[in-house]
Interface confidence: medium
């Protein structure tokens, strides 16, 4: 028979014959022959291969370097890489999460729209009319101005995006 020019899925062509690829989690030790199947061996500790492959070396699991603020979010297996995330208060600088930076704080006049996660930074928004923030914070939302009316008080000083209103007693009518 004619030697094949293409092979089925999960096979590869070598020496004019189709050999089985190694399954995820295993590396190639030797190609198949007329007599024998492809030889594959499991990846070692801290190694992985995530596809059907003919790799002779497994990939090393990613190292989550604590010196860069990283920690393990999901431990790698023989078929998956380790997933790193950042320590509390920090977030990844890229999708690959190779290093971390401190979460941004929202300045006075701005509140937290979305609290930062291990992979995304704090999202701030300006405090709209009727709300304020007088602190720099990575957690605090804009607070509503105090309602003087509900306390039977009157506004003595108007609020801003950075300060609350100041309430005071109503002026008494003199007889």
């Amino acid at each position: 028979p004619e030697p094949p020019t293409a092979c089925r899925e999960k096979q590869y062509l070598i020496n004019s014959q189709c050999c089985s690829l190694c399954q995820p989690g295993q590396k190639l030790v030797s190609d198949c022959t007329e007599f024998t199947e492809t030889e594959c061996l499991p990846c070692g500790e801290s190694e992985f291969l995530d596809t059907w492959n003919r790799e002779t070396h497994c990939h090393q699991h990613k190292y989550c370097d604590p010196n860069l603020g990283l920690r393990v979010q999901q431990k790698g297996t023989s078929e998956t890489d380790t997933i790193c995330t950042c320590e509390e208060g920090w977030h990844c600088t890229s999708e690959a999460c190779e290093s971390c930076v401190l979460h941004r704080s929202c300045s006075p006049g701005f509140g937290v729209k979305q609290i930062a996660t291990g992979v995304s930074d704090t999202i701030c928004e300006p405090c709209p009319v009727g709300f304020f923030s007088n602190v720099s914070s990575a957690f605090e939302k804009c607070h509503p101005w105090t309602s003087c009316e509900t306390k039977d008080l009157v506004v003595q000083q108007a609020g801003t995006n950075k300060t609350d209103v100041v309430c005071g007693p109503q002026d008494r009518l003199r007889a």
């Epitope: 030790v29 030797s30 007329e34 007599f35 199947e37 030889e39």
Partner: nanobody, 118 residues
């Protein structure tokens, strides 16, 4: 220079056992498939058994399946063939071979004679 040196052959009664050895040198043994072939008097070469570099994958001729076991010790650069339940038709010169192929014969030892007779 590649060298393959077989040993362990001899005269054995039908139903008996023998273990052949092949000491290899001159190449990185653990990188190659190895095999045993035999030639009976007045007949052509027949592949008996083949083993992959790590011993994970093996091949046996139908005539020896269940009776012969191929193995290797890469730390000792040695190939083995354990032959059980021997029959008269197993009488042959047994050759150790590197990189076995049905279509070519790379490197061979000088052979060891196995005679099965009562």
């Amino acid at each position: 220079e590649v060298q393959l040196l077989e040993s362990g052959g001899g005269l054995v009664q039908p139903g008996g056992s023998l273990r052949l050895s092949c000491a290899a040198s001159g190449f990185t043994f653990s990188h190659y498939h190895m095999g045993w072939a035999r030639q009976a008097p007045g007949k052509g070469l027949e592949w008996v058994s083949v083993i992959g570099p790590r011993g994970i994958s093996t091949y046996y001729a139908d005539s020896v399946k269940g009776r012969f076991t191929i193995s290797r010790d890469n730390s000792k650069n040695t190939l083995y063939l354990q032959m059980n339940s021997l029959r008269a038709e197993d009488t042959a010169v047994y050759y150790c071979a590197k990189s076995p192929s049905r279509h070519r014969f790379d490197y061979w030892g000088q052979g060891t004679l196995v005679t099965v007779s009562s």
